[in-house]
């Protein structure tokens, strides 16, 4: 759940999501239109199709919580609970280190990015 | 060899505390990945799955019955244990506990014989 | 939760005869798990991730489906497999059973 992949994000990238990703760009936090902005915009949208993914699946994407270890600054998903669970958390894990491997281009001004803003394609999954 | 045993008391009284053991060979619940699940058939029917420990004594419930259920271990003594608590003839029903497969992890691949619970109203 | 429905509940077969049992979920699940259970006995691991037959299945026995449809099936049906067959999910908690299906020798 949002639980897991704020505490994950804050872990592997050692930003705290509430005040960097959730909202950034055009589709880092809730929903998302249009063209990605730049490559940390990227990750949030692949991930959004993780989850779209996973809801096609009937996964409870927002409720299912699952257990995973951050050790030495890597995330071992738990082989514990339903697929659902699991699959979640390879989602989380993989959004996770995409913002990481980007941090070195995330631009402030994106945060808080006015959504009505966000033109073009949005892309497909 | 893995095996697992269930015992219980076998007759017990509407609104009492049921409390159940699993005594099993062959693994022991120190090793990760490892976990057993209590599961419950009433007689002529279907199988009902109540409550999971694994190794690092994360517990998992039925949601339908997880204000009476508490699943615990000792894992020297190779012990899972299962209590549920008020009781009524419903819960009449055959207990097994059953540890999943190494190669997929959501099949059991070892029961026990079970354990016939009657709940007398 | 996701809930297993099973057809049919009952049902006889001749030896030699193919057998098909089915297990629909109330929504998609991402595999299915089969037991099979004799009276007097515990459940035995039958069939997992769908299709894989668990260790001393005969090979007579498949399995196969996707989404909210699953089926085991019998090629040619001999007497020691009267029996019932438990379908059973953990694509999301909590896990779930079918109610089963009694599979009787004709």
């Known amino acids: 759940g949002i639980l897991n992949l704020n505490k994950m994000v804050k872990q592997v990238t050692g930003k705290m999501p509430i005040l960097s990703y959730w909202p950034y760009g055009c589709h880092c936090g809730l929903g998302g239109r249009g063209q990605p902005k730049d490559a940390t915009d990227w990750c949030c949208q692949t991930h959004d199709c993780c989850y779209d993914h996973l809801k096609t699946q009937g996964c409870s994407i927002y409720k299912d919580y699952y257990r995973y270890n951050f050790s030495q600054g890597n995330i071992h998903c738990s082989d514990k609970g339903s697929w659902c669970e699991q699959q979640l958390c390879a989602c989380d894990k993989e959004v996770a280190f995409c913002l990481k491997r980007n941090l070195d281009t995330y631009q402030k001004r994106l945060r808080f990015y006015w959504r009505p803003h966000c033109r073009g394609q949005t892309p497909g999954c | 060899q893995v095996t697992l045993k269930e015992s219980g008391p076998g007759i017990l009284q509407s609104s009492q505390t049921l409390s159940l053991t699993c005594s099993f060979s062959?693994?022991?619940?120190?090793?990760?990945?490892?976990?057993v699940s209590w599961i419950r058939q009433p007689s002529g029917k279907g199988l009902e799955w109540l409550a999971h420990?694994?190794?690092?004594?994360?517990?998992r419930y039925n949601p339908s019955l997880k204000s009476r259920l508490t699943i615990s271990k000792d894992t020297s003594r190779n012990q899972v244990f299962l209590k549920i608590t008020s009781v009524d003839t419903a819960d009449t029903a055959t207990y097994y506990c059953a540890r999943p497969a190494y190669y997929s992890n959501h099949l059991f691949a070892y029961w026990g014989q079970g354990t016939l619970v009657t709940v007398s109203a | 939760q996701i809930v297993l429905t099973q057809s049919p509940a009952i049902m006889s077969a001749s030896p030699g005869e193919k057998v098909t049992i089915s297990c629909s979920a109330s929504s998609s699940v991402s595999y299915m798990y089969w037991y099979q259970q004799k009276p007097g006995s515990s459940p035995k691991p039958w069939i997992y991730?769908?299709?894989n037959l668990a260790s001393g299945v005969p090979a007579r026995f498949s399995g196969s489906g996707s989404g909210t449809s699953y089926s085991l099936t019998i090629s040619s049906m001999e007497a020691e497999d009267a029996a019932t067959y438990y379908c059973?999910?953990?694509?999301?908690?909590?896990?779930?059973f079918g109610a089963g299906t009694k599979l009787e020798l004709k």
């Open positions: 062959g693994f022991s619940l120190s090793t990760s990945g490892m976990g």
């Open positions: 991730r769908t299709s």
């Open positions: 059973q999910q953990y694509h999301s908690s909590p896990l779930t």
């Open positions: 420990i694994y190794w690092d004594d994360d517990k």
